[in-house]
């Protein structure tokens, strides 16, 4: 069975400053990723950063960086200020689009006893929804 | 809840121009569909694909406002446009606005997929 694990690290030289790594554990060929804070996209959250394996890549403040890491992970950096930077509680969620297997999505926040710029290594974070 | 609210509809002559405008708002959170689409509805008729465009710019136009109307997306990625130039006749009908994503990313043929709709603006060319 497919499934995603999500990493959220805060950068020890900026407090303001996150960054959040996805990856997909399966078999298919990933055809879209979405990354979001607050909640899945187009339910409670707002999509940070869409990306495309072909297509390119789309970004909305306060993501500063997104990229592709491998064919099936990915990295965001966030850093903002006020109102539209994240805080220590936000949830980040990554979707996962892949042929044949669907869509998968998973999200975190960081761990509540971390220090900036320490985290848990990657695990699979538990699956919310398999369309 | 996702709400979608379209805004540029009137009266205009044969030849004329129109700017439709389409905001996707939510509350408590930012939608950026995937994709945002017009239809449009002529009295009498079914409805009908006008325009699509993704998130990533990719436009799609029924053969009908080749050439004629323009899809565009604010950097924002929740506000569509459809600037109508040399509008004719049979462009007479009400226009509406649709949100929804996809597995690629892409608009869906025809509209499929599309889950949020907006109440619709009229537009007739008349002179």
């Known amino acids: 069975t497919p499934e995603v694990w999500v990493q959220v690290r805060m950068e020890a030289t900026e407090l303001s400053s996150f960054t959040i790594r996805c990856g997909f554990l399966g078999s298919g060929s990933i055809s879209l990723v979405t990354v979001s804070w607050g909640g899945p996209n187009g339910a409670g959250g707002t999509t940070l950063a869409v990306l495309h394996p072909e297509r390119g890549i789309r970004q909305w403040a306060p993501a500063r960086q997104a990229r592709w890491e491998t064919q099936s992970s990915i990295s965001l950096i966030l850093e903002g200020s006020g109102a539209s930077s994240p805080c220590a509680n936000t949830t980040f969620c990554c979707k996962f689009a892949s042929f044949p297997e669907g869509s998968w999505e998973a999200c975190g926040s960081l761990p509540p006893s971390s220090d900036p710029g320490l985290s848990a290594p990657p695990t699979p974070a538990p699956i919310l929804r398999a369309d | 809840e996702v709400q979608l609210v379209e805004s540029g509809g009137g009266l205009v002559q044969p030849g004329g121009s129109l700017r439709l405008s389409c905001v996707a708002s939510?509350?408590?959170?930012?939608?950026?569909?995937?994709?945002m689409a017009w239809f449009r509805q002529a009295p009498g008729k079914e409805r009908e694909a006008v325009a699509g465009?993704?998130?990533?710019?990719?436009?799609t136009y029924a053969d009908s406002v080749k050439g004629r109307f323009t899809a565009s997306r604010d950097n924002a990625g929740f506000s569509l446009y459809l600037q109508m130039n040399s509008l004719r006749a049979e462009d007479t009908a009400v226009y509406y606005c649709?949100?929804?994503?996809?597995?690629?990313?892409?608009?869906?043929?025809?509209?499929?997929?599309?889950?949020?709709w907006g109440q619709g603006t009229m537009v007739t060319v008349s002179s």
């Open positions: 939510a509350s408590g959170f930012t939608y950026r569909p995937y994709c």
């Open positions: 649709a949100a929804g994503d996809s597995p690629d990313g892409r608009c869906p043929p025809l509209g499929q997929g599309l889950n949020y």
């Open positions: 465009i993704d998130i990533f710019g990719g436009t």
